[in-house]
Amino acid sequence: APVRSLNCTLRDSQQKSLVMSGPYELKALHLQGQDMEQQVVFSMSFVQGEESNDKIPVALGLKEKNLYLSCVLKDDKPTLQLESVDPKNYPKKKMEKRFVFNKIEINNKLEFESAQFPNWYISTSQAENMPVFLGGTKGGQDITDFTMQFVSS
């Protein structure tokens, strides 16, 4: 079945942009001017997921790369990673659960909760130039709120 997708960038609530840090990691830092071109462009897709009033299941791929954000256990801890997939088969309506995030959108602020690990969220640190990670706390020091901007190709 066809999948509804869009191209976008994400910034955390402190306006830090997300950029690649090595082949399989994202980091968050403040960018200005021409440096904004470094920020990662996501292909966000509407996928199948569990029903909830305020949650919309999405997958977050990197545009024109065969990489998707996924959530797995590493050393018994829910961990965010970039996972390589076969581009012929992705995106698809029925994504494996590790690729699915419940998008919670309130007043134009977005949160991305792992479907695999409820109450764990895509997070950034207050500090500059730190990895994007999966965090198990909301409303604490770490940042779980993002804004989204469409990207024209």
Epitope: R4, L6, N7, M44, K93, N108, Q149, S153
Partner: antibody
Framework: EVQLVESGGGLVQPGGSLRLSCTVS????????MSWVRQAPGKGLEWVGI???????YYASWAKGRFTISKDTSKNTVYLQMNSLRAEDTAVYYC?????????????WGQGTLVTVSS | DIVMTQSPSTLSASVGDRVTITCQAS??????LSWYQQKPGKAPKLLIY???TLASGVPSRFSGSGSGAEFTLTISSLQPDDFATYYC??????????FGQGTKLEIK
Amino acid sequence: EVQLVESGGGLVQPGGSLRLSCTVSGFSLSSYAMSWVRQAPGKGLEWVGIIYDSASTYYASWAKGRFTISKDTSKNTVYLQMNSLRAEDTAVYYCARERAIFSGDFDYWGQGTLVTVSS
Amino acid sequence: DIVMTQSPSTLSASVGDRVTITCQASQSISSYLSWYQQKPGKAPKLLIYRASTLASGVPSRFSGSGSGAEFTLTISSLQPDDFATYYCQNTGGGINIAFGQGTKLEIK
């Protein structure tokens, strides 16, 4: 305050073209998807299509090929280009804002603009 | 494409009545269903989304239920302002978004 204002409707001959505009205020087109929905006189609502970023547009099966949605974020305006118009395209055309990305429902609507296709 | 079928097409009722409108999808759409109210010459107004969540500013006499392929909109006690046409809408289900044909709620 969120506002959507459609314009560009009017009388057009069968086979002709028309471009509708929807100018928005109170929010940014860089963060919200916009849809067009039409309503023939005395009939029900019919979804036309939706635009996210400029490369991500989706259409009702009947609209593909004849209707094109685009936008100019700097002008806060969404467009509906309609070609090869037929009498059955006569309707009030509404633009509407998607409530949340991929929610598929629409929380704000314009007042509508009437398109009449007749010779 | 998924087809949405509403029943009844027309419903006559009185102020204070409890009324129910049904919407059936031609296949399962999970809870991806919304309800709208439209008055003559006006744009539709979002009442309920995700089958049961009340949109902002909508009175609590409106409620929605159902999942899969069967959905209902209930108005617990009709007010004069509620006489209008009501539409269900499939909001998920892949690419296509589809509306029901509408239910006209008129004064008995």
